[in-house]
Amino acid sequence: EVEKTACPSGKKAREIDESLIFYKKWELEACVDAALLATQMDRVNAIPFTYEQLDVLKHKLDELYPQGYPESVIQHLGYLFLKMSPEDIRKWNVTSLETLKALLEVNKGHEMSPQVATLIDRFVKGRGQLDKDTLDTLTAFYPGYLCSLSPEELSSVPPSSIWAVRPQDLDTCDPRQLDVLYPKARLAFQNMNGSEYFVKIQSFLGGAPTEDLKALSQQNVSMDLATFMKLRTDAVLPLTVAEVQKLLGPHVEGLKAEERHRPVRDWILRQRQDDLDTLGLGLQGGIPNGYLVLDLSMQEALS
């Protein structure tokens, strides 16, 4: 809190300009009119104000707008945005994508702060859904943004927005998130032909069910091992050796290196050893010849 002191003679600010960097904190408080500051916010970012000086400018705006800043001021906050608390931001009504971009630019190259997270949350809630332009903007600044959302939040992403998603945006998504995103991606890309469709859907396949993997195996897609290893274990288990061979194409040889890891390990345990031997990879651990496999889960479901 800065003490109220009279502005020294001749120091009253007529405009927001670089001479203000030489003002002490109490001089800024006494000599800069809050309304002048609000109308010339676009100039603040062009001037190298210190941490302490920005504190004073924020205090002036807080007094002028106790219920929250108008968007005309918010858009030009620049580095003053870094001084805002999540509580301050919750008072705002940010509707313009340009305002969002301007504020994200301030924190560019740095990890997502609580202020930025709150801002994004306010913006998305205000829009009602995560539309394509917003998603484009957010993933450009924060590639991991999509994977920071809960499955419930992801459910508000319209399929049309999926076109904005790049493979790297999904790197940190867990299976629960991909379960939500995959059906949206399938819908979004449904009119594409085989090879183009696979290129687009590939990053989302961690949420694909067995029947979709079976369908892909009929299309000569040559899935790489990295993608295969991210598939849901429960979706991979029912696939036959022939289906996995078709799904992976020339990459099938990579199964040997992954035989101790999920989902390959669990899949091997479900296959007949005879069938595994047809791959010629030396995969071991399948069901020995002559053994009968009972699916107890099916039996329990029937009883």
Epitope: A46, T50, Y51
Partner: nanobody, 115 residues
Framework: QVQLVESGGGLVQPGGSLRLSCAAS????????VAWYRQAPGEQREPVAA???????IYADSVKGRFTISRDNAKNTVYLQMSSLKPEDTAVYYC??????????WGQGTSVTVS
């Protein structure tokens, strides 16, 4: 994290000259307003010279006509050319701007002694 590295300080006689440099990681100085500050022993840090993001410059009255701030965007470096140095210019000099200034992150500074 932003890294600020000031250099070029040293011991100089009154009336002498020095050229301070400040290098920053990222593209910080090419897009932001920047300033040089100094802190004499027992004193608070004070601004000496500044350059707005638009390129206009301003100086503290005590250094006007003797110091010149400039920048090289390609090298992401800011300079402070100091001439006609006086004993009262003795201080540790720091540069800053943009995100790190707003967040109160500072470099180690470079020491200037006029004696």
């Amino acid at each position: 994290q932003v890294q600020l590295v000031e250099s070029g300080g040293g011991l100089v006689q009154p009336g002498g000259s020095l050229r301070l440099s400040c290098a920053a990681s990222g593209s910080m100085f090419s897009i932001n307003a920047v300033a040089w500050y100094r802190q004499a022993p027992g004193e608070q840090r004070e601004p000496v010279a500044a350059m707005t993001s638009g390129g206009s410059t301003i100086y503290a009255d005590s250094v006007k006509g003797r110091f010149t701030i400039s920048r090289d965007n390609a090298k992401n470096t800011v300079y402070l050319q100091m001439s006609s140095l006086k004993p009262e210019d003795t201080a540790v000099y720091y540069c800053n701007g943009g995100w790190s200034l707003a967040m109160d992150y500072w470099g180690q500074g470079t020491s200037v002694t006029v004696s």
